[in-house]
């Protein structure tokens, strides 16, 4: 069977495949940055926010130098699936304060889904296993308060921003080795 409807065909050139994934990742990175800035303007953040259910940042000193393509793609796909779940949760449970950002969160979710489809295609082209997440999925309960949902949004967008930067750096670095 061909690629899912709405997904562009992937070429047989792995560099072109990676290019395409990098482009989508960079676009999503720009969207995330813009939305994070909007969040900061509307709801100023006091320091760093974290959320236990978010994936641990894939970056650590020395990681990028020793990356392999299967590891990067698998880790990225698993992490982005988690972020997708968190964005869906924000849209559903974020409450009235986040309703003003609904169009942007919807667009972000659509871009995330598109990137995930592209990564899935790339992984099947490279005959990589479609790995399931390592840890069990933590159910996301409703935020404790309006402020809780705002803090969660800051944490989700901040984490996604850094994850996407790691992804662009990793994918471009790997492309130089192909």
């Amino acid at each position: 069977p061909g690629p899912p409807a709405g997904s562009p065909r992937v070429s047989s050139d792995p560099r072109a495949d990676l290019d395409s994934a990098v482009l989508l990742t960079r676009s999503l990175l720009a969207d995330t940055r813009q939305l994070a800035a909007q969040m900061r303007d509307k709801f100023p953040a006091d320091g760093d926010h974290s959320l236990d259910s978010l994936p641990t940042l894939a970056m650590s000193a020395g990681t990028l130098g020793s990356l392999q393509l299967p590891g990067v793609l698998t880790r990225l796909r698993v992490d982005l699936m988690s972020y997708l779940r968190h964005v869906q949760w924000l849209r559903r449970a974020g409450g009235p304060s986040l309703k003003t950002l609904e169009p942007e969160l919807g667009a972000l979710q659509a871009r995330l889904e598109r990137l995930l489809r592209r990564l899935q295609l790339l992984m099947s082209r490279l005959a990589l296993p479609q790995a399931a997440p390592d840890q069990p999925v933590i159910p996301l309960g409703p935020p404790a308060s309006a402020w809780g949902s705002i803090r969660a949004a800051h944490a989700i967008l901040g984490g996604l921003h850094l994850t996407l930067d790691w992804a662009v750096r990793g994918l471009l670095l790997l492309k130089t080795r192909l």
Partner: antibody
Framework: EVQLVQSGAEVKKPGASVKISCKAS????????MDWVKQAPGQRLEWIGD????????IYNQKFTGRATLTVDKSASTAYMELSSLRSEDTAVYYC????????????WGQGTTVTVSS | DIVLTQSPASLALSPGERATLSCRAS??????????IHWYQQKPGQAPRLLIY???NLDSGVPARFSGSGSGTDFTLTISSLEEEDFATYYC?????????FGQGTKLEIK
């Protein structure tokens, strides 16, 4: 005001190492990558590498891999570049620059640190 | 690595004139509507200053007389009406792939 302030000029002997600092202020340090660029006399600007202050490992231009080491002290909003096994062609001005995540354009630059390698 | 070639190497013009600086890449630096080319201005003894990012976006605080255009391998920086403070060296830079590289520069001098 967004600023990057670099350490002062250095004169080194061939074979030695040099470590340059770059202190960031006026913005959230972890929101941007920190990049390093070399400008040797009469040569084009050369990207050395960058580091994500949030905790990402550095990435390097292959030309500098093994000799350049990029680090950050997040608590002090300071980035460092160490260059080892210095030779005369390392004589240059070295700049730190704030890099947009994922896009590698540099919207804020340090004032530059002149490194002279001479016996 | 992608090689960027700037032309002319130097250009002598008078204040008020229009300046057109060119940057050519050894392979395309554009993809699906994004062009990963950026322009900087550098004056003697100073650090470079970002003028234009992603081919055509003016950085904050940069006068509107500066504009960038182009796609694929050919890019242009235009200064519509030169002011005294515009005489400097201009560099293009790409970020399509790693490593990012710079052009050799175009020196803009007062005629």
């Amino acid at each position: 005001e967004v600023q990057l302030v670099q350490s002062g000029a250095e004169v080194k002997k061939p074979g030695a190492s040099v470590k340059i600092s770059c202190k960031a202020s006026g913005y959230t340090f972890t929101d941007y990558n920190m990049d390093w660029v070399k400008q040797a006399p009469g040569q084009r600007l050369e990207w050395i590498g960058d580091i994500n202050p949030h905790g990402g490992g550095p990435i390097y231009n292959q030309k500098f891999t093994g000799r350049a080491t990029l680090t950050v002290d997040k608590s002090a909003s300071t980035a460092y570049m160490e260059l080892s096994s210095l030779r005369s062609e390392d004589t240059a001005v070295y700049y730190c620059a704030r890099g947009e995540l994922g896009h590698w354009y540099f919207d804020v630059w340090g004032q530059g640190t002149t490194v002279t390698v001479s016996s | 690595d992608i090689v960027l070639t700037q032309s002319p190497a130097s250009l002598a013009l008078s204040p008020g004139e229009r300046a057109t600086l060119s940057c050519r890449a050894s392979k395309s630096v554009s993809t699906s509507g994004y062009s990963y080319i950026h322009w900087y201005q550098q004056k003697p003894g100073q650090a470079p200053r970002l003028l234009i990012y992603l081919a055509s976006n003016l950085d904050s605080g940069v006068p509107a007389r500066f504009s960038g255009s182009g796609s694929g391998t050919d890019f242009t920086l235009t200064i519509s009406s030169l002011e005294e403070e515009d005489f400097a060296t201009y560099y293009c830079q790409h970020s399509r792939d790693l490593p990012p590289t710079f052009g050799q520069g175009t020196k803009l001098e007062i005629k």
